[in-house]
Amino acid sequence: APVPPGEDSKDVAAPHRQPLTSSERIDKQIRYILDGISALRKETCNKSNMCESSKEALAENNLNLPKMAEKDGCFQSGFNEETCLVKIITGLLEFEVYLEYLQNRFESSEEQARAVQMSTKVLIQFLQKKAKNLDAITTPDPTTNASLLTKLQAQNQWLQDMTTHLILRSFKEFLQSSLRALRQM
């Protein structure tokens, strides 16, 4: 698994470097998670042909994976810092159940999956410190999440492979949109 941000040898070797600002730390954290997702996607795509065939194979997706929309204020047109930050944090909180599902889905990248999950928790904490309007952030209901996790795990092998691919793809897209938006803040 890659070394978490702030623990690489370059940081140790450069004691006089300025400490990272809050924004830099968040940026670095997201890029670290994206690297982890890339590694997980590599294993998924090597293991099955889901990555090429998912478009033709899938007729309907009821996973309700978080997605950025115009109204969320994260795109350049209609950008709204506070609304967008709330959306990013809410979306990441909603992704947590899917990241939990991913934990037993990888053979050679088990540590990587855990690293993505834990780093996302840290990212949420960073972002919550940045947000002024924490009341607007809705936390997912644990009972609903537990029920969803049971359903995800009850799918057959083929559907679980498809689900894994869709989660990784959506999480990557969500983080990339978040990164672009946060760089405008």
């Epitope: 194979a57 899938l58 997706n61 009821n62 359903k151 995800l152 009850a154 083929w158 559907l159």
Partner: nanobody, 125 residues
Framework: DVQLVESGGGLVQAGGSLRLSCAAS????????MGWFRQAPGKEREFVAA????????YYADSVKGRFTISRDNAKNTVYLQMNSLKPEDTAVYYC??????????????????WGQGTQVTVSS
Amino acid sequence: DVQLVESGGGLVQAGGSLRLSCAASGRTFSSSPMGWFRQAPGKEREFVAAISGRSGNTYYADSVKGRFTISRDNAKNTVYLQMNSLKPEDTAVYYCAGERVGLLLTVVAEGYDYWGQGTQVTVSS
């Protein structure tokens, strides 16, 4: 034990119609996707149509679009396939399939958990 039982197959002339039924027992499929697949002699099993358990949305293979209609009666735990304007190339064994969770609906056979034994449809020219 879950069972899917197809009926309604038979021999029909080109241009004719048939209505296939698939009765499910052993569990309720009201929130699950259901599909029809077919297999002609010497060919792979292919997707025909599917219906979502949640939205009731329907999906069709290009080869049957506009001629076949899939529907479901949740009270009877039954799925139907109305086949109109039948062609000789529709000749195959038709299988009903069910999926147990309903988060994803796919047109791939591997995405289904339960299968019927199949009903033969023969279209003569």
